[in-house]
């Protein structure tokens, strides 16, 4: 791979209503099934067509699910995580971590099970600073006219 691929990390609360065929997605991960190196978290591996998650549109393959109805998914066996979703009731609140790929340098590729990322503020702070400098320069320029 050439160049470095980073990720913008954002969190979102997604409220799903269980459909006729359930929530409509698959998961990987858990303490006994590490999908990502040194991370036993729970990740979305599949969104089922026309399922509740697909129709809602916010949950994406590759998202990390941090909690279900306020219950943390850290340090859970894979099957325990599956059971937690299955027993979560009709209205299900998911705390989700999205990772948006940011390209640095030549072409990169998001590897299977490789979601290592950078916090969003690491990108937003410099962008904000540049915007402020540009605004200040523009104001100075206008004053000189």
């Amino acid at each position: 791979m050439n160049g470095r691929v980073d990720y913008l990390v954002t969190e979102e609360e997604i409220n799903l209503t269980r459909g006729p065929s359930g929530l409509g997605f698959n998961i990987v991960g858990g303490t006994d099934q590490q999908y990502v190196s040194n991370d036993s978290g729970i990740y979305v591996s599949r969104i089922k067509e026309n399922g509740a998650a697909a129709l809602d549109g916010r949950l994406q393959e590759g998202d990390k699910i941090l909690s279900v109805n306020g219950q943390d998914l850290k340090n859970l066996l894979h099957q325990d995580a599956v059971d937690l979703f299955r027993n979560a009731g009709y209205a299900v609140s998911l705390r989700v971590q999205h990772r948006l790929q940011v390209q640095n340098g030549p072409i990169g590729h998001r590897g299977e099970g490789d979601p290592s990322g950078i916090p969003i503020f690491m990108v937003l702070v410099p962008v904000f600073a540049l915007t402020m400098v540009a605004a200040w320069a523009f104001m100075r320029y206008r004053q000189q006219l």
């Epitope: 065929s21 698959n26 099934q33 599949r46 299977e112």
Partner: nanobody, 127 residues
Framework: DVQLVESGGGLVQAGGSLRLSCAAS????????LGWFRQAPGKEREFVAA????????YYADSVKGRFTISRNNAKNTVYLQMNSLKPEDTAVYYC?????????????????????WGQGTQVTVS
């Protein structure tokens, strides 16, 4: 993308045995849920057996229970179907199917829509 390649089919006499193999690509094979289906000429695709990611849970069609055994070797990225006491009605093209991860909904191993990836199939003929 996940690729599945079946092998081990052939012609066998009634009462004989065969072992089918399905080799899968992908670094995360140990997370796949895997199944075997079959399709006889002029018939619909039929569920045969399935196995969860760890190999700890298996599912079988009533027609093959006690005769067929599904297993997997995560180190070799391979799932197997051991077929014993074969009958002429077992004649079909046998397909391997896979999906990454476990559904958070109730799982129907016999539903082809549970799977995203399919092999090209291997012919089994029982005379």
């Amino acid at each position: 993308d996940v690729q599945l390649v079946e092998s081990g089919g052939g012609l066998v006499q009634a009462g004989g045995s065969l072992r089918l193999s399905c080799a899968a690509s992908g670094r995360t094979f140990s997370t796949y849920t895997l199944g075997w289906f079959r399709q006889a000429p002029g018939k619909e695709r039929e569920f045969v057996a399935a196995i969860n990611w760890s190999g700890g849970t298996t599912y079988y069609a009533d027609s093959v229970k006690g005769r067929f055994t599904i297993s997997r070797n995560n180190a070799k990225n391979t799932v197997y179907l051991q077929m014993n006491s074969l009958k002429p009605e077992d004649t079909a093209v046998y397909y391997c199917a896979a999906v990454i991860g476990s559904t958070v909904d109730s799982y129907d191993p016999g539903d082809p829509l549970e799977y995203d990836y399919w092999g090209q199939g291997t012919q089994v003929t029982v005379s």
